[in-house]
Interface confidence: medium
């Protein structure tokens, strides 16, 4: 059974991940971002199901395309360069889902825009955090 300290650590990691994802979304949604139209043409795979930490495998697998789109944007709205943002997210995701578990991600048939993709994972983080508090 998870201890209160491990639950607290998980909660903090999820909050960190949530902040990173929200920062990216805010940078993209900034009305001054001239590349938003181009960024919205890129398609992201969405998880069929995202209710447990192991489902973060689906986010991990989409971090490379996410980094590519952020590279293209190279927006001044981001305080961190894309590589550092992705590195931060990747490390948190690996810790949360556990690197030993081999979970095969199942994706929904419909692809999504970067905004829909980020909103989906933001909702996921918020949902898990609410069950921990």
């Amino acid at each position: 059974a998870p201890t209160s300290s491990s639950t607290k650590k998980t909660q903090l990691q999820l909050e960190h991940l949530l902040l990173d994802l929200q920062m990216i979304l805010n940078g993209i949604n900034n009305y001054k971002n001239p590349k938003l139209t181009r960024m919205l043409t890129f398609k992201f795979y969405m998880p069929k199901k995202a209710t447990e930490l192991k489902h973060l495998q689906c986010l991990e697998e989409e971090l490379k395309p996410l980094e590519e789109v952020l590279n293209l944007a190279q927006s001044k709205n981001f305080h961190l360069r894309p590589r550092d943002l992705i590195s931060n997210i990747n490390v948190i995701v690996l810790e949360l889902k556990g690197s030993e578990t081999t979970f095969m991600c199942e994706y929904a048939d419909e692809t999504a825009t970067i905004v829909e993709f980020l909103n989906r994972w933001i909702t996921f983080c918020q949902s898990i955090i609410s069950t921990l508090t």
Epitope: K64, E68, L72, R81, R83, S87, V91, L94
Partner: antibody
Framework: EVQLVESGGGLVQPGRSLILSCAAS????????MHWVRQAPGKGLEWVSG????????GYADSVKGRFTISRDNAKNSLYLQMNSLRAEDTALYYC?????????????????WGQGTTVTVSS | DIQMTQSPSTLSASVGDRVTITCRAS??????VAWYQQKPGKAPKLLIY???SLERGVPTRFSGSGSGTEFTLTISSLQPEDFATYHC????????FGQGTKVEMK
């Protein structure tokens, strides 16, 4: 089919120059960083140089800095390596390789497509 | 340049064995490590990128782990076609390869 074909290798005397070329096809060349990697006979791999998709960022291994120059012509889907002041230790099979990540400006990722290499022999 | 030290340099194993190759960076490279397989007379083939992400089309018996300075490539059950040389590479600052690990038949 994604393909990289190197050319320009050969036998050259120490101190002389050589230009290697790499012709790319089957992918959007100007989206990706590109690299030169070499392998001396019976040895491991050595990264030589890399260039970002828009030529805005260029890097070299310490062993070739100041002697080698990487460049690309996106209109011709071509990558080049100008090798000056060649030394015996530059003798190797030179591979052209495509980076994995699109639009990387400051850095490199991993190399997912490689050519078959062109041999450079530096000897008197 | 960041140094990448691979161990062992040669590894003798049999089909079905679990094989582990280690790579140590001279300074932290975060998760920016790739692993390649190379067979004699052939160009290297990308297996793992970003320390643990499996390249498309690579069998799931290959896995990578680690972050910071310590990285591992594991082959869960060695197959006849896996006898080759394996190279690690950091791409945090420029790029540097390890010296290679030859996996040979015991």
């Amino acid at each position: 089919e994604v393909q990289l074909v190197e050319s320009g290798g050969g036998l050259v005397q120490p101190g002389r120059s050589l230009i290697l070329s790499c012709a790319a096809s089957g992918f959007t060349f100007d989206d990706y960083a590109m690299h030169w990697v070499r392998q001396a006979p019976g040895k491991g791999l050595e990264w030589v140089s890399g260039i970002s998709w828009n030529s805005g960022s260029i890097g070299y291994a310490d062993s070739v800095k100041g002697r080698f120059t990487i460049s690309r012509d996106n209109a011709k889907n071509s990558l080049y390596l100008q090798m000056n002041s060649l030394r015996a230790e530059d003798t190797a099979l030179y591979y052209c390789a495509k980076d994995q990540l699109r639009w990387g400006t400051y850095y490199y990722y991993g190399m997912d497509v490689w050519g078959q290499g062109t041999t450079v022999t530096v000897s008197s | 340049d960041i140094q990448m030290t691979q161990s062992p340099s040669t590894l003798s194993a049999s089909v079905g064995d679990r094989v582990t190759i280690t790579c140590r960076a001279s300074q932290s490279v975060s998760i920016w490590v790739a692993w390649y397989q190379q067979k004699p007379g052939k160009a290297p083939k990308l297996l793992i990128y970003k320390a643990s992400s499996l390249e498309r089309g690579v069998p799931t018996r290959f896995s990578g782990s680690g972050s910071g300075t310590e990285f591992t490539l594991t082959i869960s059950s060695l197959q006849p076609e896996d006898f080759a040389t394996y190279h690690c590479q950091q791409y945090d600052t420029g790029a540097t390869f390890g010296q290679g690990t030859k996996v040979e038949m015991k």
